[in-house]
Amino acid sequence: ITRQSLDPQRRAAPQQKRSSPTEGLCPPGHHISEDSRECISCKYGQDYSTHWNDFLFCLRCTKCDSGEVEVNSCTTTRNTVCQCEEGTFREEDSPEICRKCRTGCPRGMVKVKDCTPWSDIECVHKESGTKHTGEVPAVEKTVTTSPGTPASPCS
């Protein structure tokens, strides 16, 4: 997901650190002045830049949505890292929302992988070991298990 923006309304506060651009670019944690003469530091906890750049404004820090936890807070050189809450995960094809992990596998299948913030539980057929990734059919009896514990950040 890209939840970042250059904010043309915000101007650098006078107390912000300034330096000269190198080859027309400013280092991570800074943006460039409109006359290209100065590099102005981003505001800690408010905005950031991750690369050498000539942004007129630093990028706004992401605010984690409800249903997400903040794994790393925003610094001047790194955006906030948000992660789905325990028992939910973020799918690649719908990264904007945290989906509930399945609570168990369909009959005849066993769980081989716990729920993590970036993947649902994984079930395989007892005999063949073939993966099953679909939703649990409503008529199937499920074996309930507790969701996995978040292990590392997913951005």
């Epitope: 190198t22 027309g24 290209s36 690369h51 050498w52 750049n53 000539d54 942004f55 990028l59």
Partner: nanobody
Framework: EVQLLESGGGLVQPGGSLRLSCAAS????????VGWFRQAPGKGREFVSA????????YYADSVKGRFTISRDNSKNTVYLQMNSLRPEDTAVYYC???????????????????WGQGTLVTVSS
């Protein structure tokens, strides 16, 4: 919010020309340099060209040097890519990009960008 709108793509014969335009609808590109990238079918996005809107300094990928020309009209908040002597290998979706990002200050080729247009398709075929 920065929004980039490209236009000018189309079908052209080898050796032909096209001019792409990129307008910033939010009244700002949000950065001094604005560039063009392209993505050929089944390939990754590659840098094509960039321009410094303040002083007009230009940057080109080796594959387009001498054939493509980037320019800007600051009064219209628009950047252009004039593409001449087009080849079949130039066939791609062309993206306008702003907020270019570089790994080192001396780099001429950006590794990415913050803002992207929707892209305009350029097809070079006889």
């Amino acid at each position: 919010e920065v929004q980039l709108l490209e236009s000018g793509g189309g079908l052209v014969q080898p050796g032909g020309s096209l001019r792409l335009s990129c307008a910033a609808s939010g009244r700002t590109f949000g950065s001094i340099r604005v560039g063009w990238f392209r993505q050929a079918p089944g390939k990754g996005r590659e840098f094509v060209s960039a321009i410094n809107r303040n002083d007009g300094t230009t940057y080109y990928a080796d594959s387009v040097k001498g054939r493509f020309t980037i320019s800007r009209d600051n009064s219209k908040n628009t950047v252009y890519l004039q593409m001449n002597s087009l080849r079949p290998e130039d066939t791609a979706v062309y993206y306008c990009a702003a907020g270019l990002q570089y790994n080192r200050s001396a780099d001429r080729v950006p590794v990415g960008a913050v803002y992207w247009g929707q892209g305009t398709l350029v097809t070079v075929s006889s």
